[in-house]
Amino acid sequence: KKVVLGKKGDTVELTCTASQKKSIQFHWKNSNQIKILGNQGSFLTKGPSKLNDRADSRRSLWDQGNFPLIIKNLKIEDSDTYICEVEDQKEEVQLLVFGLTANSDTHLLQGQSLTLTLESPPGSSPSVQCRSPRGKNIQGGKTLSVSQLELQDSGTWTCTVLQNQKKVEFKIDIVVLAFQKASSIVYKKEGEQVEFSFPLAFTVEKLTGSGELWWQAERASSSKSWITFDLKNKEVSVKRVTQDPKLQMGKKLPLHLTLPQALPQYAGSGNLTLALEAKTGKLHQEVNLVVMRATQLQKNLTCEVWGPTSPKLMLSLKLENKEAKVSKREKAVWVLNPEAGMWQCLLSDSGQVLLESNIKVLPTWSTPVQP
């Protein structure tokens, strides 16, 4: 007996071939001997089966001695043995219909779990193997679970169901809802405008929710809410914003915040959370602000940074086109009695300059100029 695997909701074509390459009488029945369809000359006739409105054939193949049974919009309960009667012969085909569904929404928050459930006909013993977009394989029986979804799990999951050495492939599109970056650092000189961007790693037609940016300044003992906002159909509207600092927010996606001035008291780290409508849990992105200030007071030239810097970062003071006068893995460096000229304060990571501030030191009879 030939075995054919089908997918729930799909179309299957069961073949039946006569030895004569011409249109002759045929009919298809189910295991209960109820007629599904057949022919009368060049016309298709249908029987009283449950498949009535979903069963079809291809007249174009009848002349070649092929009499297929097409079953549309397959259901699990269509699993059965189908019998084709032609030329006093009987051809039996066993159809097994499977369904594979994500038993939650296919749009999941980063860190959540994905469960895939296999629907199968009674008496079948299928095995399932799924391959994630990043090439990770998972195997299982009736259910497959993946915990702690990551951004790279977004995309098409390809699942193969094996039964009777036959296979059927399912493709399920999964969208992991997350920000493109888990965290980011912005390096700014004191007084510069700061732009924070929070691009999403997914696109959906309608996006509604609410969000908040909490900020922990390095100098402050506790964190505070800088801004709260609503998101409606990808349009952003500010609900509440602190007076200091007075943040501005873009009205469209990606989420965009502007801090008018980088000041030492703002240096620190923030956490932007976004709660999406009809989703449990929140999206998070960490953002860090590092602020640099170079100053000259009397005979002391000082360079300082505030904010979350890694211990391996190097802070240096150097006269333009000369070797660094001072270079330390600290958050403040200074030079006593600096020579006149353009001094550079550099924050660097393995030789790569992250932040630079210039200060002009004038001969001792005049006051310093900050460009």
């Epitope: 997918k7 299957v12 079809d56 054939s57 291809r58 007249r59």
Partner: antibody
């Protein structure tokens, strides 16, 4: 949603062959047959043949028998139509079309965007 | 091969008009006929199948009738987007054949 994306325009010399591809997505590739229909500039539509992507069986219009070959690659969900011994009258837009079956009859439900094949010396 | 003949080959009409296009088969094709709409530079689109069944998503102002050898496509009230070329096609048996087309233009 069903999408049929065809390969780009081709310019061929008389006597040469052309192979046009049609990549299917948005449905189970092996569950529906694919037809090829062509349309000469400013002219009507002409059916060329059909392929069953599941088994690869084909049926061609008598007019193209011996010159046309339809094949498929199930791993990439792509069907191909190759036409050989090209002549100037083969200059046309070639379409692939996925069918729908209703009461035993095939109709052309979804069409590719078309591929212009120009045969010129 | 079954020959399909459409008339008229071109037709001028105004928005809101009722328009009828006819198609004749050289032999009986029962109701195995389809109507396709084609706009310049685009692929054809299935409007009607089985002579009178409206394809999903097609506006109800389009209707088809006929059986055997004579068929008609009717547009009850022309809309600006309906100006195109219309083809009938027999799907009785291979090779499937099309009418020469009816070009519907704005008057």
């Amino acid at each position: 949603q069903v999408q049929l994306v065809q390969s780009g325009a081709e310019v061929k010399k008389p006597g040469a062959s052309v192979k046009v591809s049609c990549k299917a997505s948005g449905y189970t590739f092996t569950s529906y047959y694919m037809h090829w229909v062509r349309q000469a500039p400013g002219q009507g539509l002409e059916w060329m043949g059909i392929i069953n992507p599941s088994g690869g069986s084909t049926s061609y219009a008598q007019k193209f028998q011996g010159r046309v070959t339809m094949t498929r690659d199930t791993s990439t969900s792509t069907v191909y139509m190759e036409l050989s011994s090209l002549r100037s009258e083969d200059t046309a837009v070639y379409y692939c079309a996925k069918d729908i079956v209703h009461d035993g009859t095939e109709y052309f439900q979804h069409w590719g965007q078309g591929t212009l094949v120009t045969v010129s010396s | 091969d079954i020959q399909m003949t459409q008339s008229p080959s071109s037709l001028s009409a105004s928005v809101g008009d009722r328009v009828t296009i006819t198609c004749r088969a050289s032999q009986s094709i029962s109701d195995w006929l389809a109507w396709y709409q084609q706009k310049p530079g685009k692929a054809p689109k299935l409007l009607i199948y089985a002579a009178s069944s409206l394809q999903s998503g097609v506006p109800s102002r389009f209707s088809g009738s006929g059986s055997g050898t004579d068929f008609t496509l009717t547009i009850s009230s022309l809309q600006p987007e309906d100006f195109a070329t219309y083809y009938c096609a027999q799907h009785n048996h291979y090779p499937y054949t099309f009418g020469q087309g009816t070009r519907l233009e704005i008057k």
